[in-house]
Interface confidence: medium
């Protein structure tokens, strides 16, 4: 089991240290927005801070966002699905309730 969640999509209007402007953050670097991170990474919450994490690949578990404001702050977030992929219910995954169904990154 893995209880990370998806990127929450909000960005903060804040100033970054000059160091962050000169070099893009690698995996694990603390960030405030996805533009702080290197290619293939996004800025996602990892509880103590937001850090650069890999954008999800095909077949990887993702979290489908419900309506904005329908849940509290997510402590551990996953990135969004990579280009050409969307977060959809895994076809062979059967669960009792709709909300608990496993979502994965799938080709459009």
């Amino acid at each position: 089991g893995n209880d990370h969640s998806t990127l929450d999509g909000y960005s903060r209007r804040t100033t970054l240290s000059s160091k962050m402007y000169h070099s893009k953050g690698q995996e694990g670097s603390v960030c405030l927005r996805s533009s702080d991170c290197a290619t293939g990474l996004c800025c996602a919450r990892h509880f103590w801070s937001k850090i650069c994490k890999p954008v999800l690949k095909e077949g990887q578990v993702c979290t489908k966002h419900r309506r904005k404001g329908s849940h509290g702050l997510e402590i551990f977030q996953r990135c969004y699905c990579g280009e050409g992929l969307s977060c959809r219910i895994q076809k062979d995954h059967h669960q009792a309730s709709n909300s608990s169904r496993l979502h994965t990154c799938q080709r459009h």
């Epitope: 893995n2 240290s17 995996e27 694990g28 103590w48």
Partner: antibody, heavy 112, light 112 residues
């Protein structure tokens, strides 16, 4: 439930090295970063660094660079923190934390 | 020397309200990094009280609340109880140190 089990208390002499362990259970060990935080007697909390349990990548606090090494063994869901050239002011309780969950701490005494 | 400053102590009678401040700078709290609060009972590991500035984990009473404004944050305890007697620490990230930092800590005493 999430648990972080730390190794037993240790007594060391100045100049020696220390290696303590933190074994995770009840969660997907490679999916998280593990941090090490220490607390000297009667003092506050001091962050030492983190290890990415998946890749093994590390980031150490400036105060400990060159003296600390963090490693992990995903096959047994364990992380390790090694501190070299011990001094008396390294006497502290050393905690491992997944950020939201903490181990109970390992008491380390450095004395000649 | 911690970059997050807290008052060394705070006190109140049972049922009263106590507020603890955590003052930082433009390289930590003021830069937009989140503030978390921990409670540490004597001889125990820190326990998460507030995360992401103002969010309460499940199991933490609603007597505890957190807020953040500018370069500082605060923790409020309303309806103070005897079991709230503990040390409280704020925590954030500091971009100039490239590391996580804890506040100096505040000892809360419940009077009489």
């Amino acid at each position: 439930q999430v648990q972080l089990l730390q190794s037993a208390a240790e007594v060391k002499k100045p100049g020696e090295s220390l290696k303590i362990s933190c074994k995770g259970s009840g969660y997907d060990f490679p999916g998280y970063y593990l941090h090490w935080v220490r607390q000297a007697p009667g003092q506050g909390l001091e962050w030492m660094g983190w290890i990415n349990a998946n890749s093994g990548a590390t980031n150490y606090a400036q105060n400990f660079q060159g003296r600390v090494t963090m490693t992990r063994d995903t096959s047994i869901s364990a992380a390790y923190m090694e501190l070299s050239s011990l001094r008396s002011d390294d006497t502290a309780v050393y905690y491992c934390t997944r950020e939201d969950h903490w181990g109970r701490g390992t008491t380390v005494t450095v004395s000649s | 020397q911690s970059v997050l400053t807290q008052p060394p102590s705070a006190s109140g009678a049972p049922g009263q309200r106590v507020t603890i401040s955590c003052t930082g700078s433009s390289s930590n709290i003021g830069a937009g990094y989140d503030v978390h609060w921990y409670q540490q009972l004597p001889g125990a590991a820190p326990k998460l009280l507030i995360y992401g500035n103002s969010n309460r984990p499940s199991g933490v009473p609603d007597r505890f609340s957190g807020s953040k404004s500018g370069t500082s944050a605060s923790l409020a305890i309303t309806g103070l109880q005897a079991e709230d007697e503990a040390d409280y620490y704020c925590q954030s990230y500091d971009s100039s140190l490239s590391g996580y930092v804890f506040g100096t800590g505040t000892k809360v005493t419940v009077l009489g």
